[in-house]
Amino acid sequence: MKALSPVRGCYEAVCCLSERSLAIARGRGKSPSTEEPLSLLDDMNHCYSRLRELVPGVPRGTQLSQVEILQRVIDYILDLQVVLAEPAPGPPDGPHLPIQTAELTPELVISKDKRSFCH
Amino acid sequence: MKALSPVRGCYEAVCCLSERSLAIARGRGKSPSTEEPLSLLDDMNHCYSRLRELVPGVPRGTQLSQVEILQRVIDYILDLQVVLAEPAPGPPDGPHLPIQTAELTPELVISKDKRSFCH
């Protein structure tokens, strides 16, 4: 079914930041001694290359910035959400936090009032 | 159906580096002059926070590294790929049915040897 393609493409988008290191960390990749380690920049470039391959409307021959590529990735995924037109499942609640120290836990260090923008 | 969850979760992972600017560009967001710009670090932290919210098996109360979160995100999406790649069960001689929510519970576990590389 068509839904597989975007999920797989999206999977590439998330995963390939450190694809080889993940495979090695999980005992499934080649030993790092047998090949040159990829730098984070190489991993990032690889990720955007894969996105160019996987997302329609991002031809590899054109000059697009990383933000432009992400914009097209997002548009593509939003389109897929419209096609699927079903709500996503979610958790029952956030983490349990102590009443008094709740605002000081490591996960809550970033400014939380900014969180409403990524939904 | 739950198939949307990975797309949405993955969308958060890809999008939230620059979601507000995208919303503004597409005429959906507030003008940037009305609020403080988010730093890249804040966006990344928010992104992982959203992943914790969206991916089963990544309870927000636990301490997980970003790599561990991504590993679980990848495993989850791979699980969904397996489910999406197989026809959903239906009544004998009946029509093909959409994936049922029960098939995508957080407890869904596929054979881990299928998850070898980040492809």
Epitope: I99, A102, R115, H119 | -
Partner: antibody, heavy 111, light 111 residues
Framework: QSVEESGGRLVTPGTPLTLTCTAS????????IHWVRQAPGKALEWIGY??????TYYASWAKGRFTISKTSSTTVDLKMTSLTTEDTATYFC???????WGPGTLVTVSL | AVLTQTPSPVSAAVGGTVTISCQSS????????LSWFQQKSGQPPKLLIY???KLESGVPSRFKGSGSGTQFTLTIIDVQCDDAATYYC????????????FGGGTEVVVK
């Protein structure tokens, strides 16, 4: 740190009503906020929540008639439409973790 | 999902032990996302136990939670007069709706 509900009153069937949950001592944009109701002499009933990121989820019976939204960093609204006598209850808001509850606000739907 | 609690009322003598069960028709989130609340007349619920067995701050250690998946138990040892109340379980689920569901409540009467 506390929350308090307001807006409960006597209304006639079909009248829309909006309840407000107001936080003190913390920002609602940092936490999930749940709405729960309890009809007189009956069990607690979860209505829905709004997450810190603004995502909303509802009980299946509440979908379509109830809407949860953030109106500021200290207030969350519960909008109710097509009210019937069955919606007569005390409505509570609770913070993430369900360890902080408001005292409740009574909504009475009667002819 | 449906959460079924021990029928009310349950009687206990001061100093005795009370056990309340809560059964879910499907596994809760992470197999442990179940909470217990105490509610007295005219008051909001008070969280006692979260994530099956974790004691909320300030709650006496006489309250113990156990279970996993679909079957859960709240045990009150050395029952006190103050423990007379209605107790609710709350199950959490990874879902598109009905993410949280309360049990029907169990009234505990202390003799």
């Amino acid at each position: 740190q506390s929350v308090e509900e307001s807006g409960g009153r006597l209304v006639t069937p079909g009248t829309p009503l909006t309840l407000t949950c107001t936080a003190s001592g913390f920002s609602l944009s940092s936490y999930y906020i749940h709405w729960v109701r309890q009809a007189p002499g009956k069990a607690l009933e979860w209505i829905g929540y709004i997450s810190d990121g603004g995502t909303t989820y509802y009980a299946s019976w509440a979908k379509g008639r109830f809407t949860i939204s953030k109106t500021s960093s200290t207030t969350v609204d519960l909008k109710m439409t097509s009210l019937t006598t069955e919606d007569t209850a005390t409505y509570f808001c609770a913070r993430q973790g369900f360890n902080i509850w408001g005292p409740g606000t009574l909504v009475t739907v009667s002819l | 999902a449906v959460l079924t609690q021990t029928p009310s009322p349950v009687s206990a003598a001061v100093g005795g032990t009370v056990t309340i069960s809560c059964q879910s028709s499907q596994s809760v989130y992470n197999n442990n996302w179940l909470s217990w609340f105490q509610q007295k007349s005219g008051q909001p619920p008070k969280l006692l136990i979260y994530e099956t067995s974790k004691l909320e701050s300030g709650v006496p250690s006489r309250f113990k939670g156990s279970g996993s998946g679909t079957q859960f138990t709240l045990t009150i040892i050395d029952v006190q007069c103050d423990d007379a109340a209605t107790y609710y379980c709350l199950g959490g689920y990874w879902s598109t709706s009905d993410n949280n569901i309360f049990g029907g409540g169990t009234e505990v009467v202390v003799k």
